[in-house]
Each structure stands twice: as C-alpha cells, then as structure tokens.
C-alpha cells in the first residue's frame, strides 16, 4: 500500500475566458513532511503556479475544504483565466530537505479555455 | 472499535533503555501515521516520535532525536519505541495515537508510565 | 519551534454558562485555507481525546456544544453551554510544523 497518494480528480477542466478555474487535489497525508506546489507543464521548463510559502501568486487562491476528514486537501483557485493560461497542471508533494526533494505528483489536470 | 493499548513502561536507571510497545485493533493500522506523545505534569503534553504509515519516514523532536527509535510492523499491527539513554526528564505517561492524514491525533491509548531514576 | 500560549490557566464557569478557551500560536499555523489547529479534552486519570480538527471541525460524536474558531495565530474553543461532564483541561496543538506542540492546558471548573 502507498505511504502518500496524490489525487488530482479531474483528468480535463473547461473554463470560459475570464471565469475563475478550479483546480483539485487532496493528498492523503501531510507525512512525509514537506510542501505541496503547483506546477503548469512537466520537466525543468514547467511553470510555478501556486507555492504556500515562497513567491507572489495574486490570480491564485488555496480554496481547501478542511471538513474533509480522512484526506487533506490541496486546491486552488485561478481567477481571470486567458487563453495563455491553457495547459496541464500538476499538483506535486515534496519531502522537505536542503533543498526539498519531489516525492510525488498527481496525474495532471488539463485546463482548456473557451471564448467567451 | 477502534483500540491502542501499550505496554512496556517501567522504572529504569539513568543510562538505560526501555522498548515501548502499541498494540493496535479496529481500524486500517497500515493506513495510518503513528505517532508517540508525552505527558508530564511540569511540561505537560510533548510530541515524541511519528512514523509514516508504511514505516518509511520518521520523525522526532532535538530532545529525543539519536536517542529513541520509532519503528512499526504493519503485519502485526504493532508500533514499538525504543528508547535508549533514557534521564530523569524523559519520565512521563507515553501515549501512543494515530493520525490518519497525519495531522490531528485521532485516537489514543491509556497510555504507560516510564519512571527514569536512580 | 511554534510556540503555544493558551489563556487562562484554569477556569470556573456556572452551569449552563459559556466557558471560552484562547490558544495563541507564535507564528500562523495557516497552509492552503487550513488552520492546523486541533483541541483535546482530557479528563483526569484518562488519555486525551480529539474535539475539534483544523481549527473549526468538530470530530465526530462530540456534542455540538463544542464549537471552535479563529485563524492564523489566533484560536478560540468555546463549550455553551457548559454541563457537569464538561470539567477537564483542555489543550490545543499546532501540527504546521516540525516539532508539534501543544498548549499549556486550561483546567475548566464549575463555578
């Protein structure tokens, strides 16, 4: 059995232009210790969406439930969606460290962008 | 119903070692982080150790750390703390909870007395 | 290492009275709209026991008299009205960050 299961829900999500996009995710656990970021794309090119504690992000919102009781959960809100901000988003668990290590990401979430 | 019941407190000389045991019933024990606290009437309730569900990661405070070992046997639905160069401020009630998204404590047992002292 | 301050140290209510608990947190214990602050009763000669999650949830089969706020630094457990089975102490924890710790206690009496 897994230690840590990052879940993404959604495989697609499908936004107007100037609407607000909700992205999810719920980890199972907050062990092991360490952040969870948001990422747009994969690889060393990929975007840094949403980080709790480093950096300025003002179109994203954390919009949690924190009812829910057997996981924790992780997701975000982006307000004022453009055609730019089309893409895959990945919801990523890091074990902290010096620097912090990536442990696990969810399966990805594609945003498309509709005209309004 | 779920149960946590420990084992393994006692007296000990300063220096000495004792191994605490957490035998665990009524719920997914393998999907559960596991966690030791502490409660002395000075200092109150102490976090002591915590153990990723599969065992694979381990936590503890400076005041523990190098001296106690956290370990668990899922088979057995067991959690074990071993405790070595014990002193006379390690003295408590030690608890034993789960914590199934590894947050808040969920559940705790009665608890075992460990009594450091020469 | 967060520090917790819980406020008072003890506290006699009358029956049917509202008895608030404050717990101050030495940096935010906020992350992604989660307060992770919980609240413990614990009566004598018995092991804590979990009444409210996150800062505002209350764990399941605990009397809804029991309710829980606050955010960031500053948290508050509020029993009303207060019944005899009430009396303990009640401790609030942080688990934000590495070492979790807890309040001093509040020590709850009927007046």
């Known amino acids: 059995e897994e230690e840590l299961q990052v879940i993404q829900p959604e495989k697609s999500v499908s936004v107007a232009a100037g609407e607000s996009a909700t992205l999810n995710c719920t980890a199972t656990s907050l062990i092991p210790v360490g952040p969870i970021q948001w990422f747009r794309g994969v690889g060393p090119g990929r975007e840094l969406i949403y980080h709790q504690k480093e950096g300025h992000f003002p179109r994203v919102t954390p919009v949690s439930d924190p009812t829910k009781r057997n996981n924790m959960d992780f997701s975000i809100r982006i307000s004022n969606i453009t055609p730019a901000d089309a893409g895959t988003y990945y919801c990523v668990k890091f074990r902290k460290g010096s620097p912090d290590v990536e442990l696990k990401s969810g399966a990805g979430t594609e945003l498309s962008v509709r005209a309004k | 119903e779920v149960q946590l019941v420990e084992s393994g407190g006692g007296l000990v000389k300063p220096g000495g070692s004792l191994r605490l045991s957490c035998a665990a019933s009524?719920?997914?024990?393998?999907?559960?982080?596991m966690s030791w606290v502490r409660q002395t009437p000075g200092k109150g309730l102490e976090w002591v150790a915590t153990i990723s569900s599969g065992g694979t990661y381990t936590y503890y405070p400076e005041s523990v750390k190098g001296r106690f070992t956290l370990s668990r046997d899922n088979a057995k639905n067991s959690l074990y703390l071993q405790m070595n160069s014990l002193r006379a401020e390690d003295t408590a009630v030690y608890y034993c909870a789960s914590q199934l998204t590894g947050s808040e404590f969920d559940y705790w047992g009665q608890g075992t007395t460990v009594t450091v002292s020469s | 290492d967060i520090v917790m301050t819980q406020s008072p140290a003890s506290l006699a209510v009358s029956l049917g009275e509202r008895a608030t608990i404050s717990c101050r947190a030495s940096?935010?214990?906020?992350?992604?709209?989660?307060?992770?602050m919980h609240w413990y009763q614990q009566k004598p000669g018995q092991p804590p026991k979990l009444l409210i999650y996150?800062?505002?949830n209350l764990e399941s089969g605990v009397p809804d008299r029991f309710s829980g706020s606050g955010s960031r630094t500053d948290f508050t457990l509020t029993i009303n009205p207060l019944q005899a089975e009430d009396v303990a102490t009640y401790y609030c924890?942080?688990?934000?960050?590495?070492?979790?710790?807890f309040g001093g206690g509040t020590k709850v009496e009927i007046k």
């Open positions: 940096e935010s214990v906020d992350s992604y709209g989660n307060s992770f």
């Open positions: 924890h942080q688990s934000a960050d590495l070492p979790w710790t």
């Open positions: 009524g719920f997914t024990f393998s999907s559960y982080v």
């Open positions: 996150r800062a505002s």
